[in-house]
């Protein structure tokens, strides 16, 4: 499906006429798109510990380990985004993998991702059964990094 950007509103073909309760096929294809985390998410409850693993995915081996948290909006493309959540306030020692080093801080690395929101077309709410895709930047934390603390002057 091609996108046309028009005055801040991205239209699917014909600005997407659709019937209530019957989503057009294009929308179902679009809305089911998601940005998956590098590793599958576990939906079980578990206490995520502040430690660097010896094996496993990057996010658990890092000295600033993080977990992924779901951000779901059915009216957004992509529908699912994953935010990195730092598991430690400081960085983990490379030697032990568990002791924290107060000389380093574990902080999220942010990225402004382009997303599209499904909206009524401007000035047409409640009239034509059409919708528009509005392009926006959305802040997502990609990973956690180990940084030296800022020194206040």
């Amino acid at each position: 499906v091609s996108l046309r950007i028009q005055e801040g509103c991205s239209h699917l073909p014909s600005c997407c006429p659709s019937k209530e309760q019957e989503p057009p096929e294009e929308w179902l294809k679009w809305s089911s798109a998601s940005v998956s985390p590098p590793e599958p998410l576990s939906h079980t409850h578990h206490a995520e510990s502040c430690r660097a693993s010896k094996d496993g995915p990057l996010n658990s081996r890092a000295i600033s380990p993080w977990s992924y948290e779901l951000d779901r909006d059915l009216n957004r493309v992509p529908q699912d985004l994953y935010h990195a959540r730092c598991l430690c306030p400081h960085c983990v020692s490379l030697q032990t993998g568990s002791h924290m080093d107060p000389l380093g801080n574990s902080v999220p690395l942010y990225h402004n991702q382009t997303v599209f929101y499904r909206r009524p077309c401007h000035g047409e709410e409640g009239t034509h059964r059409r919708y528009c895709l509005e392009r926006r930047l959305y802040r997502v934390s990609l990973a956690c990094v180990c940084v030296r603390p800022r020194v206040m002057a």
Epitope: H43, L74, N75, R119, E125
Partner: antibody
Framework: QVTLKESGPTLLKPTQTLTLTCTFS??????????LGWIRQPPGKALEWLAH???????HYKPALKSRLTITKDTSKNQVVLTITNVDPVDTATYYC?????????????????WGQGTLVTVSS | DIQLTQSPSFLSASVGDRVTITCSAS?????MYWYQQKPGKAPKPLIY???NLASGVPSRFSGSGSGTEYTLTISSMQPEDFATYYC???????????FGQGTKLEIK
């Protein structure tokens, strides 16, 4: 038409596990965008959202209660089950299940558009 | 977590009165939803996506607002409108549904 009905014990003792079942008809929980949530209301108090399960089995829980809650679905039986472990008298409430997933021309709604009649659960020693 | 604060918590009104209930969010949100609940009954959807009336809801009900401030207005109170009203929002990250503490509308 869409109907939902909650079932479960009416009286529990503290520390026991509460298992509530929502049996629904008139829609399918395998339809993209569909979801079902549990909401409770202590006597004379406000509504409190507890948990939600989507068509694709993704689950969300109220953060403060996450360790005690589990939500599951059986699409073939048209049922959603909520379990609450280690109940306390403060868990005494009317428990509702409600559907979410109404699709309009402009997108999905996050309103609970259909509700069950609720089931009163009392926790007392 | 986003908090919702409804005001007032209690409101006495007469038939024919114009009534406004406010719902304030602790941070900016896209949409607000409103429900009506009568004693011993399940909540009933009233307004979805801030300003759209749910099916079968009389036109005397209306919703408006943006950002952190949202309102539910009843243009002319009717006897069947005396009930408790709740606002609700959905937050996508982390995915949570939040309700206001309710506004009880009583007959003056």
């Amino acid at each position: 038409q869409v109907t939902l009905k909650e079932s479960g014990p009416t009286l529990l003792k503290p520390t026991q596990t509460l298992t509530l079942t929502c049996t629904f008809s008139g829609f399918s929980l395998s339809t993209s965008g569909m979801g079902l949530g549990w909401i409770r209301q202590p006597p004379g108090k406000a509504l409190e959202w507890l948990a939600h399960i989507w068509w694709d089995d993704v689950k969300h829980y109220k953060p403060a209660l996450k360790s005690r809650l589990t939500i599951t679905k059986d699409t073939s039986k048209n049922q959603v089950v909520l379990t609450i472990t280690n109940v306390d008298p403060v868990d005494t409430a009317t428990y509702y299940c409600a559907r979410m997933g109404q699709l309009h021309y402009y997108g999905y709604d996050y309103a609970m558009d259909y509700w069950g009649q609720g089931t009163l659960v009392t926790v007392s020693s | 977590d986003i908090q919702l604060t409804q005001s007032p918590s209690f409101l006495s009104a007469s038939v024919g009165d114009r009534v406004t209930i406010t719902c304030s969010a602790s941070s900016s949100v896209s949409y607000m939803y409103w429900y009506q609940q009568k004693p011993g009954k399940a909540p009933k959807p009233l307004i979805y996506r801030t300003s759209n009336l749910a099916s079968g809801v009389p036109s005397r009900f209306s919703g408006s607002g943006s950002g952190t401030e949202y309102t539910l207005t009843i243009s002319s109170m009717q006897p069947e409108d005396f009930a408790t009203y709740y606002c609700q929002l959905y937050h996508s990250y982390p995915p949570t549904w939040t309700f206001g503490q309710g506004t009880k509308l009583e007959i003056k």
